[in-house]
C-alpha cells in the first residue's frame, strides 16, 4: 500500500508511517515502527507537558517568584504548567502572571468603582455631585454628603467632591 | 518562614509499625509534593515516595510499595510516613521534603530527620 | 528505573585543587540536581536543573551535563566543601538518587 502523506488526529508522521502521539503528561521515548507502538514516559517531577506530543523533553514548571509579589494559585501537574497568582494588594501585569504591581489607590475626590482583583488593578471614578471622598484608598467607594436636613440642622459649609457637608443648627428667632 | 518539624526518635520492635510526621510552616503543603527520603546509617540517600495533598496521590518507587504508606492532613499542614513489618533494614534517617512551589527550587527545604532504629 | 553512578565514590583534594564529580545516568534524563551533606545534617539542595546554583553556594561550584552524563565541578577546592555530593534526577519516576561521592580535604 501507499505510505500515508497525512495522519490522523493524535498521530504524527514519520518514516512514512503513521505514530501515536504521546498523551499530555507523557513524553516521547521512541518513535512507533512497522512492529512496535510509540513508546512514552510520564513526566517527572516538576515538569509538565500539556498537549499531545512528540516532545522528547517535558517543560519545566514555572516559578511564583515571591520577589515579584507571586504566589502559588495552583501548582503544576504532569499535565499542567503552575499558575502564579499575586500577593494580596498586588495585581498581575499581564495575562501570563509574570510579575505584579501594587493596586493604585484612588485619590480623594476619586472613589473606587471596581476593586482590583489578582489580575486586575482598581477602576476609580470621579465622585459626583453630591458625593465625596477624602482619602487615598484602594477601597473606598464615593460617600454621600451628609443630610443636614435629615438632623433638623442646617449646611454650614458647603460640600466639595473631596470634603463632606459641615453642618450646624438652624438660626433660632430671638423672641 | 519555612520550616519543617519532625516527630521524635523511634525505637521499634522487629514487626511492628511506626508512623512518622512532618508538619510544615511558613506555606500550605497543598502547594507542594510531600517527599520522603530515607537514609541508612552510613549510607547513601533513597527515595521512598510523594503524595499530593491536594488529591491523596501518591507515587512511590516500587521497593518500598507495602512497606510505606505516605498521607497526609491539610487541615493541619502535616505529611505522614507509615512503615510495617518492621525489620533491622528499617532502621534509618527518615527526611520529608517538599517540593514547593513557592520555593525557586525543588527540596530547598528538609526536616531535621526522624531515626527509626529496629531492635528486640 | 533509572540507575545513577556517581564517580569516583570517594576522593580527596588539596586546597585550591579543581574537583570533578561525575554522575552517569543509564538512560537519558532531562536534568540533574546535586545535593551536599555533611555529617550529622540534613541533606542542602546544591546545584537544580543541571547547573543552577542553589543560594548561597560559592560561585566556585557549577553544574553541567545533558542526556546520561552530568558533572559537578569545584574551581577550587577549599576546606569547608569537605562533605558528601549525591546526584539526583527527577525527569523519571521513581526519583532516584547517585550512590554518592564523599570528598575529602587532602
Known amino acids: 500500500p501507499e505510505p500515508p502523506t497525512a495522519c490522523r488526529e493524535k498521530q504524527y508522521l514519520i518514516n512514512s508511517q503513521c505514530c501515536s502521539l504521546c498523551q499530555p503528561g507523557q513524553k516521547l521515548v521512541s518513535d512507533c515502527t512497522e512492529f512496535t507502538e510509540t513508546e512514552c514516559l510520564p513526566c517527572g517531577e516538576s515538569e509538565f507537558l500539556d498537549t499531545w506530543n512528540r516532545e522528547t523533553h517535558c517543560h519545566q514548571h514555572k516559578y511564583c517568584d515571591p520577589n515579584l509579589g507571586l504566589r502559588v494559585q495552583q501548582k503544576g501537574t504532569s499535565e499542567t504548567d503552575t499558575i502564579c497568582t499575586c500577593e494580596e494588594g498586588w495585581h498581575c501585569t499581564s495575562e501570563a502572571c509574570e510579575s505584579c504591581v501594587l493596586h493604585r489607590s484612588c485619590s480623594p475626590g476619586f472613589g473606587v468603582k471596581q476593586i482590583a482583583t489578582g489580575v486586575s488593578d482598581t477602576i476609580c471614578e470621579p465622585c459626583p455631585v453630591g458625593f465625596f471622598s477624602n482619602v487615598s484608598s484602594a477601597f473606598e467607594k464615593c460617600h454621600p454628603w451628609t443630610s443636614c436636613e435629615t438632623k433638623d440642622l442646617v449646611v454650614q459649609q458647603a460640600g466639595t467632591n473631596k470634603t463632606d457637608v459641615v453642618c450646624g443648627p438652624q438660626d433660632r428667632l430671638r423672641a | 518562614q519555612i520550616q519543617l518539624l519532625q516527630s521524635g526518635a523511634e525505637l521499634v520492635k522487629p514487626g511492628a509499625s511506626v508512623k512518622l510526621s512532618c508538619t510544615a510552616s511558613g506555606f500550605n503543603i497543598k502547594d507542594a509534593y510531600m517527599h520522603w527520603v530515607k537514609q541508612r546509617p552510613e549510607q547513601g540517600l533513597e527515595w521512598i515516595g510523594r503524595i499530593d495533598p491536594a488529591n491523596g496521590y501518591t507515587k512511590s518507587d516500587p521497593k518500598f510499595q507495602g512497606k510505606a504508606t505516605i498521607t497526609s492532613d491539610t487541615s493541619s499542614n502535616t505529611a505522614y510516613l507509615q512503615l510495617s513489618s518492621l525489620t533491622s533494614e528499617d532502621t534509618a534517617v527518615y527526611y520529608c521534603a517538599p517540593n514547593y512551589y513557592g520555593s525557586r527550587y525543588p527540596f530547598a527545604y528538609w526536616g531535621q530527620g526522624t531515626l527509626v532504629t529496629v531492635s528486640s | 528505573q533509572i540507575v545513577l553512578t556517581q564517580s569516583p565514590a570517594i576522593m580527596s583534594a588539596s586546597p585550591g585543587e579543581k574537583v570533578t564529580i561525575t554522575c552517569s545516568a543509564s538512560s537519558s534524563v532531562s536534568y540533574m540536581h546535586w545535593f551536599q551533606q555533611k555529617p550529622g545534617t540534613s541533606p542542602k539542595i546544591w546545584i537544580y536543573?543541571?547547573?543552577n546554583l542553589a543560594s548561597g553556594v560559592p560561585a566556585r561550584f557549577s553544574g553541567s551535563g545533558s542526556g546520561t552524563s552530568y558533572s559537578l565541578t569545584i574551581s577550587r577546592m577549599e576546606a569547608e566543601d569537605a562533605a558528601t555530593y549525591y546526584c539526583?534526577?527527577?525527569?523519571?519516576?521513581?526519583?532516584?538518587f547517585g550512590a554518592g561521592t564523599k570528598l575529602e580535604l587532602k
Open positions: 536543573f543541571t547547573s
Open positions: 539526583q534526577q527527577g525527569s523519571t519516576y521513581p526519583l532516584t
